[in-house]
């Protein structure tokens, strides 16, 4: 059985944003390599990242097949240069990940304000509908396609000359808000899935202000 000492992976952690999903773990390998397997609760195990010296593995291609499924991964440790030299008749060391349900747990990426348009005392603010790596009929779905009405956006807006913020919400990607004529406003948006218990909110988008390039103004 040799005298090579392998150690099991630990601190297995899912890092996922807008369904781009990477499994990370420790330790940095010394004289060992790793292979990852992923499975749904009821499905078969699929191997990824064969005999790698990395401590991360991109599992996006697997989880986007069904983002509402619950996944489990495990990381195997093998002696470098001799992956047959493991434990009892080749049984390797391995560690199981926490369970991961992409639809419920993937972080919402920072949204972007695509445009805003002022028509008199109303401003239409449009949030960019970010493309994900989830496919349907060979096309990539947007965040709205995947989450539907589960996803809302909160708009924070305020006069450039003051700090008092107002909020608006939408379950589309557009806001129509009332503004004071002649005033410049600044905007920031946040993606929210109210039904979630974890990772409910994204970080705020970069602030966009009227009088800058993104806006379009039409005085009526």
């Amino acid at each position: 059985s040799g005298t090579t000492n392998t150690v099991a992976a630990y601190n297995l952690t899912w890092k996922s944003t807008n369904f781009k999903t990477i499994l990370e773990w420790e330790p940095k390998p010394v004289n060992q390599v790793y292979t990852v397997q992923i499975s749904t609760k009821s499905g078969d195990w699929k191997s990824k990242c064969f005999y790698t010296t990395d401590t991360e593995c991109d599992l996006t291609d697997e989880i986007v097949k069904d983002v509402k499924q619950t996944y489990l991964a495990r990381v195997f440790s093998y002696p470098a240069g001799n992956v047959e030299s493991t434990g009892s008749a080749g049984e390797p060391l391995y560690e199981n990940s926490p369970e991961f349900t992409p639809y419920l747990e993937t972080n919402l990426g920072q949204p972007t304000i695509q445009s805003f348009e002022q028509v008199g005392t109303k401003v239409n603010v449009t949030v960019e509908d970010e493309r994900t790596l989830v496919r349907r009929n060979n096309t990539f779905l947007s965040l709205r396609d995947v989450f539907g009405k589960d996803l809302i956006y909160t708009l924070y807006y305020w006069k450039s000359s003051s700090s008092g913020k107002k909020t608006a919400k939408t379950n589309t990607n557009e806001f129509l808000i009332d503004v004071d004529k002649g005033e410049n406003y600044c905007f920031s948006v946040q993606a929210v899935i109210p039904s979630r218990t974890v990772n409910r909110k994204s970080t705020d988008s970069p602030v966009e202000c009227m009088g800058q390039e993104k806006g379009e103004f039409r005085e009526i």
Epitope: S1, T3, N5, A8, G87, S88, E91
Partner: antibody
Framework: QVQLVESGGGVVQPGRSLRLSCVAS????????MHWVRQAPGKGLEWVAL????????NYADSVKGRFTISRDKSKNTLYLQMNSLRAEDTAVYYC????????????WGQGTTVTVSS | EIVLTQSPGTLSLSPGERATLSCRAS???????LAWYQQKPGQAPRLLIY???SRATGIPDRFSGSGSGTDFTLTISRLEPEDFAVYYC????????FGGGTKVEIK
């Protein structure tokens, strides 16, 4: 809490069969390597069989190879040992035990079930 | 098959004394694959040490393991009344095998 409970032991005649069961609670048998270990009266521990985490690979002690079969049922979270062509020397307390993936050792054991092979 | 030979067969000691148990392998064993168990009459074995020197969860620090290659040792620094039992070493190499056991009895 994490627990294993064996059943199915009893008195059986030589040449007959018996199936032992081991029900797990607090963890999933299909995520870990699972073993059967036996102990003849007044003797030491003897490893019997192993089913890997993958449920496909199986290993057996030479003394039981071809007669015993280890298996598991994911839906019942249960480990089995099918024992055929039993012999007097198979008389023992049979324990099921778990090997977690992270190290080479059996960290959870059942209380044991007694098999007596006698005519 | 790797054969594990434990010595002594029986160790007679008093509470508070130090116990040193030996396990010798017929060929080199990776320390990752060496474990120690305690068994009391009528009970299942209990994992004490894995990886030759790592204590299992809930095991008091008076138990320690050491060794490499073919020679491994379990040490109980100060025997408590509940430590009197049979101790087995086990290797997880090409096939899993146990040593014959060492009985630690009250002198």
């Amino acid at each position: 809490q994490v627990q294993l409970v064996e059943s199915g032991g009893g008195v059986v005649q030589p040449g007959r069969s018996l199936r032992l069961s081991c029900v797990a609670s607090g963890f999933t048998v299909s995520n870990d390597g699972m073993h059967w270990v036996r102990q003849a009266p007044g003797k030491g521990l003897e490893w019997v069989a192993l089913i890997w985490y993958d449920g496909v690979n199986k290993n057996y002690a030479d003394s039981v190879k071809g007669r015993f079969t280890i298996s598991r049922d994911k839906s019942k979270n249960t480990l089995y040992l099918q024992m055929n062509s039993l012999r007097a020397e198979d008389t023992a307390v049979y324990y099921c035990a778990r090997r977690p993936g992270t190290f080479y050792g059996l960290d959870v054991w059942g209380q044991g079930t007694t098999v007596t092979v006698s005519s | 098959e790797i054969v594990l030979t434990q010595s002594p067969g029986t160790l007679s000691l008093s509470p508070g004394e130090r116990a040193t148990l030996s396990c010798r392998a017929s060929q080199s064993v990776s320390s990752s694959y060496l474990a120690w168990y305690q068994q009391k009459p009528g009970q299942a074995p209990r994992l004490l040490i894995y990886g030759a020197s790592s204590r299992a969860t809930g095991i008091p620090d008076r138990f320690s393991g050491s060794g490499s290659g073919t020679d491994f040792t379990l040490t109980i620094s100060r025997l408590e009344p509940e430590d009197f039992a049979v101790y087995y070493c086990q290797q997880y190499g090409s096939s899993l095998t146990f040593g014959g056991g060492t009985k630690v009895e009250i002198k």
